[in-house]
């Protein structure tokens, strides 16, 4: 049904759902200390432009006693919870900020008449794309999969010069949210990734996994698998590895790679890690001082939502436009804006765009160093290191399949 | 409009050292590689090094490892490179060259003529 | 490293005529890349991933190849086109360029 927004003469609302069932387990109140954050940047911003106007944020707690299971599994009816305790209370902001897990997002966009934006850091999966009202701020499978299609078919860099159409995904089940949506694209036999490449097969067992490592009668080369080192470790351990075998380690949330005093573990050298290029300011601010490196892209999502709307508020109030309308509600798209660490490009999805890194483990140093780039607004990637000291053979990566001549 | 321009001819005394610039516009600097071309008269094209201005990633051509040293200065979005224990051999033209990924050195500078003699 | 073996060296033409240089490599290759370096100007980008023309090419210019052969033809040459063309590869590091065809007018 529709609700009354409080957006309107001067004051203007964000409601922030705080959910039980979260993308990433974070104590709440880092959450709220992220807004509060956004809101006074987006204060002074409002008032720097002569706009004397009033943003407040309005905190809809889930009464947890129902969906407790703490990840996002019970999601689903809990946005739909809250949502109805909005409408009950008649207290809906001129933009909703959360949920964060795919099942809610997606059941809330379906069952709502959403005339008002929704900001999400997360709603990773490939059901919440193309959709007309919502932002998400962290970047979507749809993302991964363009990435990881470009560079299988990539074959004119000197250290990669065979496409490959073929690979095997690690997914077991017991991964992150964001892990399990990326997985589960990869998977999906109607994704671009499925559509593009000719061999691909799910493991799903860890023995299914060590098996492949030395199988001379593996199907490919190439291992796709989500999570941080710790987590290859403990599914690999020292095992011996197949000398043309390729792990690419989706690590997206991750910018421990980065810091200078990091060397990369000896099991790491058959890897290519897929993570975001750092935030410049992000170590040393105020709100991610107490938050680990994954759980900081998570608040700093929640921010980013803030400053977006300040950034939009401030645009339609100078052109003196009604922010309760569907124009503003659709609006939240195609766009860049300042965020707490630089700019923030939205796609004409509304999907944010970022530079996702692929690193390698160097022989020589032991340390993680760039070997490309990848721009997932323009789709095109920057090779970085155009010699890079690998331990495969020739200093190239491998073909993808064992065997198979020259390309 | 994306231009590099180089620093001026050089002419160098054997033994001594010249440091060649390349100065960046009409792009992101950052954005790109940076790679050092030679052409010695009546030499095909020797491709030196490349530099990554964003991480500082180089590579050399083992063969001019030893002989040229890059650098770069994101603030000036500008290239270096310094050719140190000058030869009568060293005697060139050397160039800057874009890295536009697929099309490789899809700009160049006008070249630096740098000419060692005694 | 990768030799590039570029053929004629020297090539005499009329304007009108059809041109066509060689490039080979001494071993196999993806893709080739041309260059056009007129006298006393640096080089400039003229086909990439073998067929692919550089930004403001005419398209009487066309690249094709493959493995170790690749060629660079010019259907119907013009005054302008008369130049030093140089091959380059970037399959194995490091980059290394042909010696060049210098395309003369006859």
């Known amino acids: 049904s529709q609700v009354s927004q409080n957006c309107h003469n001067g004051s203007y609302e964000i409601s922030v759902l705080m959910m039980g069932n979260s993308a990433f387990a974070e104590p709440l109140k880092n959450l709220e200390d992220a807004v509060n954050e956004g809101l006074e940047i987006v204060r002074g911003r409002l008032q720097n432009a002569g706009l004397n106007v009033t943003v407040n944020a309005t905190f809809m707690y889930s009464d947890g006693l129902i969906h407790n299971s703490g990840d996002c599994r019970s999601s689903t009816c809990e946005g739909l919870d809250l949502l109805r305790k909005i409408s009950n209370a008649q207290r809906m902001g001129c933009v909703l900020i959360g949920p964060s897990c795919t099942y809610s997002t997606f059941q809330m966009y379906l069952d709502t008449e959403l005339s008002y934006p929704m900001i999400s850091a997360g709603s990773f999966g490939l059901s919440c794309d193309y959709k007309e009202t919502l932002t998400r701020l962290m970047s979507p499978a749809r993302k991964l999969m363009y990435f990881l299609v470009n560079f299988w078919k990539t074959n004119d860099l000197p250290f990669k010069t065979y496409s490959w159409s073929t690979s095997y995904v690690y997914k077991n089940g017991t991964e992150t949210e964001d892990c399990f949506w990326y997985l589960n694209a990869l998977e999906a036999s109607v994704s671009y990734f499925s559509h593009e490449l000719g061999f691909k097969v799910v493991l799903r067992q860890d023995k299914e996994f060590q098996d492949i490592l030395m199988d001379h009668n593996r199907k490919s080369n190439v291992i796709i698998m989500c999570g941080g080192p710790e987590f290859l470790y403990k599914l690999k351990g020292d095992r011996a590895v197949a000398e043309d075998i390729v792990i690419i380690l989706v690590d997206l949330f991750n910018d421990q790679y980065f810091e200078d005093n990091v060397t990369a573990p000896d099991y790491m050298k058959n890897v290519l890690v897929l993570t975001l290029s750092p935030g410049n300011s992000l170590l040393n601010s105020s709100f991610s001082r107490n938050l680990s490196p994954t759980k900081r892209d998570f608040a700093l999502a929640y921010l980013n939502g803030i400053l977006l709307f300040g950034h939009m508020l401030k645009i339609f109030l100078e052109n003196g436009e009604n922010i309760t309308t569907p124009k503003f509600a659709h609006a939240f798209r195609n766009l860049t804006f300042e965020g707490y660490d630089g700019p923030v490009t939205l796609d004409d999805w509304g999907d944010v765009d970022s530079t996702m890194v692929l690193l390698y483990t160097s022989v020589d140093t032991k340390k993680y160093k760039v070997l490309l780039t990848y721009d997932t607004h323009v789709n095109k990637t920057y090779p970085v290191d155009m010699s890079p000291t690998f331990t495969w053979k020739n200093s190239k990566l491998p073909n993808d399949i064992t065997g198979r001549g020259p390309q | 409009e994306v231009q590099l321009v180089q620093s001026g001819a050089e002419v160098k005394k054997p033994g001594a050292s010249v440091k060649v610039s390349c100065k960046a516009s009409g792009y992101t600097f950052t954005d790109h590689n940076m790679n050092w071309v030679k052409q010695a008269p009546g030499q095909r094209l020797e491709w030196m090094g490349v530099?990554?201005?964003?991480?500082?990633?180089?590579n050399y051509n083992q063969k001019f490892k030893d002989k040229a040293t890059i650098t770069r200065d994101t603030s000036a979005s500008t290239a270096y490179m310094e050719l140190s224990s000058l030869r009568s051999e060293d005697t060139a033209v050397y160039y800057c060259?874009?890295?536009?990924?697929?099309?490789?050195?899809?700009?160049w500078g006008q070249g630096t003529t740098v000419t060692v003699s005694s | 490293d990768i030799q590039l073996t570029q053929s004629p060296s020297f090539l005499s033409a009329s304007p009108g005529d059809r041109v066509t240089i060689t490039c080979s490599a001494s071993s196999s290759v993806n893709y080739m890349y041309w260059y056009q370096q007129k006298p006393g100007s640096s080089p400039k980008s003229w086909i990439y991933r073998t067929q692919n023309l550089a930004s403001g090419v005419p398209s009487r210019f066309s690249g094709s190849g493959s493995g170790t052969e690749y060629t660079l033809t010019i259907s119907s040459l013009q005054p302008e086109d008369f130049a030093t063309y140089y091959c380059q590869q970037y399959h194995d590091y490091p980059p290394t360029f042909g010696g060049g065809t210098k395309v003369e007018i006859k």
């Open positions: 530099m990554n201005p964003k991480f500082g990633t180089i």
């Open positions: 060259a874009r890295d536009n990924y697929p099309n490789y050195f899809d700009y």
